[in-house]
Amino acid sequence: QPPPPPPDATCHQVRSFFQRLQPGLKWVPETPVPGSDLQVCLPKGPTCCSRKMEEKYQLTARLNMEQLLQSASMELKFLIIQNAAVFQEAFEIVVRHAKNYTNAMFKNNYPSLTPQAFEFVGEFFTDVSLYILGSDINVDDMVNELFDSLFPVIYTQLMNPGLPDSALDINECLRGARRDLKVFGNFPKLIMTQVSKSLQVTRIFLQALNLGIEVINTTDHLKFSKDCGRMLTRMWYCSYCQGLMMVKPCGGYCNVVMQGCMAGVVEIDKYWREYILSLEELVNGMYRIYDMENVLLGLFSTIHDSIQYVQKNAGKLTTTIGKLCAHSQQRQYRSAYYPEDLFIDKKVLKVAHVEHEETLSSRRRELIQKLKSFISFYSALPGYICSHSPVAENDTLCWNGQELVERYSQKAARNGMKNQFNLHELKMKGPEPVVSQIIDKLKHINQLLRTMSMPKGRVLDKNLDEEGFESGDCGDDEDECIGGSGDGMIKVKNQLRFLAELAYDLDVDDAPGNSQQATPKDNEISTFHNLGNVHSPLK
């Protein structure tokens, strides 16, 4: 093993380097000193470092680490932010279209109901939107309220159109009769099932994406411990104290330090993998009754069928209601003629079918595919950070935290650090409280996602979940279907080009909380760049 070169007799190189890091030279010794007060860069002989310099190195090392972590997660973070925004907007558009379709159905088939029907339909779809965004509303109550509100209008406008104003106080009675007599048959129940299942899945999908953002934000803004700061300082900066300005850390040493510093973060890996796979399961199951696009856009048809059902049973119902709500009834039921086949104006509801056009379903699949690119993200972070900070290739003449060596030996390094900070201790400390919290949230959402995926009869790919990771993994840079009469009713295909309506591409500036995320400018984004090229080992 070659002896370390003698330290710079005047500390001149160290001074000029440190000045770029911290203007002013008051902390830098002019000539090598014993360095008995040093706590991190423990000297084997005279040193060009002081305690204050050590502190500055530690701060810089931690900032560099944070910056590297942020640059690593930039693409993944924007992917989720962008998609959460796109899907939220897309779901709003679906709700808006569904409301318009339902209103069009009333306008074209039951014009006498329109003023009130529009109001009730509007309230229903407002509740749908609020539910998707996480509001504490019961879907069954929403559907019940829609039909409770509609029936008195249907009764007074369609079934009994000549009722005098004095008879209109029967509304409460009619609302009650609606449920007791099951005047809409099983349609309200059918709608409850479809709407609640599809909205539940939609809501949890959005929740999962928002949690994804939270996970990245949490790890993105981790403050590394002082212990980690000491290890990073020893690896990146202590060589400077001996005047070894050009030497690089040993690759193996860097990996050990990063595994130690990021032990808590890497613990997220298992739950992150499960998160992506569970989200994929959910997305695979988002069709038919579990696809809000499909359900909500077909709702007008089911509501139309339910009104036809009432009309078919009008005679029977009127007699029964006449008895139930007798005190308010002023006249006998006078049946009006309604044609059997009530078609929706195809011009109003026609949805163009375009070959290969993009649907929410294809966009979801695309998101999952892209997310799967990042399934090993957390296990790869230590390797990414080592590969983005200078390390000696093949460990030839490299820095092991204490001295210049021909190759890194973990055992020797551990022995040499007996009196210093122990790498093993750092690993054993467990994750930071914020990391533990985010792991708990991931466990919770994974549980929810799995629960939601169960009815589809799919099982997570055990193979993928249980696969061991090779060391190289870190090394790079890196049921029911929708009911409906079908009698000539047009089916609204799941082919709306919503994504053409919304900003599919969401420019970087439009992404929430992402103003500078995608294109860091060398001179503005962080310490890592601000520190300049000379002193930073991370160039």
Epitope: A72, M74, E75, L76, F78, Q82, R273, E366, Q369, K370, K372, S373, F374, I375, S376, F377, S379, A380, Y384, D461, N463, L464, E467, G468, F469, E470, G472, D473, G475, D476, D477, E478, Y504, D505, L506, D507, V508, A518, T519, P520
Partner: antibody, heavy 119, light 107 residues
Framework: QVQLVQSGAEVKKPGASVKVSCKAS????????MNWVRQAPGQGLEWIGW????????NYAQKFQGRATLTADKSISTAYMELSRLRSDDTAVYFC????????????WGQGTLVTVSS | EIVMTQSPATLSLSPGERATLSCRAS??????LSWYQQKPGQAVRLLIY???NRATGIPARFSGSESGTDYTLTISSLEPEDFAVYYC?????????FGQGTKLEIK
């Protein structure tokens, strides 16, 4: 060290099929996408599609849909690209390239396999 | 599909000079852009991903930036080994697409 080693050059007749292999090492094969890209003589690069070896999920460029088939054998960490109904304009160097885990960009590439289609 | 247009097709410069390679996307790609280097007989190499992030082992003289749908690869001071063909690639929307390439040659 991540390595992608591809099978050797092939000469095929029009209408035939070719199957190119790509053996991966140095990383967890199942957990990254494997892309296939081709380059006709003197031309630029063209993406064929990708496969996720963990579950066999695939995505193809429309142009190659129905003619290219991407498969993977996890047990030997090898990805395959089969192209059927070969035409003379399929003569190209075919590359495999890995995506992930920090970017969807293609972080590592194979050395390429020349496929010549000639009668 | 998204069309990526690179310019110039050929760039003739001397070592030590600054090289600026351009790539324009036919529609927004939200910074999902990579740059690759290809030399004869060698594997293609990822230089920059997500517009501005240097890949493993890529020297600091390589940098990437964007302005709207225009993306730029800059090599601050050319080294002899930098003379090669450079491709940009978008991975915002399927199918992933490449530019036609810019050949950087010694003047």
């Amino acid at each position: 060290q991540v390595q992608l080693v591809q099978s050797g050059a092939e000469v095929k007749k029009p209408g035939a099929s070719v199957k190119v292999s790509c053996k991966a090492s140095g990383y967890a094969f199942s957990n990254s996408w494997m892309n296939w890209v081709r380059q006709a003589p003197g031309q630029g690069l063209e993406w064929i599609g990708w496969i996720y070896p963990g579950d066999g999920d695939t995505n193809y460029a429309q142009k190659f849909q129905g003619r290219a088939t991407l498969t993977a054998d996890k047990s030997i960490s090898t990805a395959y690209m089969e192209l059927s109904r070969l035409r003379s304009d399929d003569t190209a160097v075919y590359f495999c390239a890995r995506s992930g885990p920090i970017t969807m960009g293609f972080t590592y590439w194979g050395q390429g396999t020349l496929v010549t289609v000639s009668s | 599909e998204i069309v990526m247009t690179q310019s110039p097709a050929t760039l003739s410069l001397s070592p030590g000079e600054r090289a600026t390679l351009s790539c324009r996307a036919s529609q927004g790609i939200s910074n999902y852009l990579s740059w690759y280097q290809q030399k004869p007989g060698q594997a293609v190499r990822l230089l920059i991903y997500y517009t501005s992030n240097r890949a493993t082992g890529i020297p600091a003289r390589f940098s990437g930036s964007e302005s709207g749908t225009d993306y730029t690869l800059t090599i601050s001071s050319l080294e002899p080994e930098d003379f090669a063909v450079y491709y940009c690639q978008q991975y915002s929307k399927f199918p992933w697409t490449f530019g036609q390439g810019t050949k950087l040659e010694i003047k």
